[in-house]
């Protein structure tokens, strides 16, 4: 599990909200833009992390749990 700083009243995820102290996002958008939740068909897109949707590009990206890396958070981060 990651370094979420989410308070206990929420249904916790393994990585916090963008802007909180999380592992760097992979598949970076070309420009700063708006993210929303990934559509349901991407429910299992991120193997060890949370999926978020790059609205301008209509593509999914992943915020990896601590200790994982890769476009879909599919690899163990050996440097962690």
């Amino acid at each position: 599990s990651g370094n979420s700083t989410r308070s206990p009243e929420t249904n916790g995820l393994s990585c916090g909200y963008p802007g909180e102290n999380c592992t760097a996002t992979t598949v970076q958008p070309k420009r700063k833009g708006h993210f929303s939740r990934c559509p349901k068909q991407y429910k299992h897109y991120c193997i060890k992390g949370r999926c978020r949707f790059v609205v301008a590009e209509q593509t999914p990206s992943c915020i990896c749990d601590e200790g994982y890396t890769g476009a879909r958070c599919e690899r163990v981060d050996l440097f962690y």
């Epitope: 963008p18 708006h34 929303s36 939740r37």
Partner: antibody, heavy 119, light 107 residues
Framework: QVQLLESGGGLVQPGGSLRLSCAAS????????MSWVRQAPGKGLEWVSG???????TYTDSVKGRFTISRDNSKNTLYLQMNSLRAEDTAVYYC?????????????WGQGTLVTVSS | SYELTQPLSVSVALGQTARITCSGD??????VHWYQQKPGQAPVLVIY???DRPSGIPERFSGSNSGNTATLTISRAQAGDEADYYC?????????FGGGTKLTVLG
């Protein structure tokens, strides 16, 4: 304790303006997307506007160009500036916290503030 | 624009099972959330992501979503369950609510 408290509602004439505020407490306000949802008397819920933690804004068609959503993270406060008000804007306005980001669900709601547009 | 359709009212006998439906085109491909609202109060989230329950919500509340219909099921209905219930989904960067269903608990 996680809490949202709206204020600023009242009676305003058609064409007038009003600014609603929503004071947040008990959580890291700047980390969440926030929304305004309204409910006309005896009617259902209608989403009005949303604001992401990085400043992205989105509105329902009927308020575009008239309403502006904003936030002041230093004051833990969400705002809704309402201009060119119409009778059909009469409703209880709720401030709601989006779980994580846009596209999730509203896990915390305020108690609402009533806006009445009438001459 | 995307539309969610709910029955205006549903009645259930005390202790029995109530089912409230929410219909929308291919709604099964979207996440659906349910809110309970009692008179004069703010809405409360009772089901999120089709079938998950927030902490503090009784196990009697459950949800399902498939095809063109999402369903909120309330087992062993109690008098305190009498309220308006709204389904909600996300479409094209905007929030969509159903029209709401008034649940009446008889007896």
């Amino acid at each position: 304790q996680v809490q949202l408290l709206e204020s600023g509602g009242g009676l305003v004439q058609p064409g007038g303006s009003l600014r609603l505020s929503c004071a947040a407490s008990g959580f890291t306000f700047s980390s969440y997307a926030m929304s305004w949802v309204r409910q006309a008397p005896g009617k259902g819920l209608e989403w009005v506007s949303g604001l992401g933690h990085v400043g992205y804004t989105t509105y329902t068609d009927s308020v575009k160009g008239r309403f502006t959503i904003s936030r002041d993270n230093s004051k833990n406060t969400l705002y809704l500036q309402m201009n060119s008000l119409r009778a059909e804007d009469t409703a209880v306005y709720y401030c709601a916290r989006d779980y994580l980001d846009f596209g999730y669900y509203f896990d915390v709601w305020g108690q609402g503030t009533l806006v009445t547009v009438s001459s | 624009s995307y539309e969610l359709t709910q029955p205006l009212s549903v009645s259930v006998a005390l202790g029995q099972t109530a089912r409230i439906t929410c219909s929308g085109d291919k709604i099964g491909k979207k996440y659906v959330h349910w809110y309970q609202q009692k008179p004069g109060q703010a809405p409360v989230l009772v089901i999120y992501d089709d079938s998950d329950r927030p902490s503090g919500i009784p196990e009697r509340f459950s949800g399902s979503n498939s095809g063109n219909t999402a369903t909120l099921t309330i087992s062993r209905a109690q008098a305190g369950d009498e309220a308006d219930y709204y389904c909600q989904a996300w479409d094209m960067q905007s929030v969509v609510f159903g029209g709401g269903t008034k649940l009446t608990v008889l007896g």
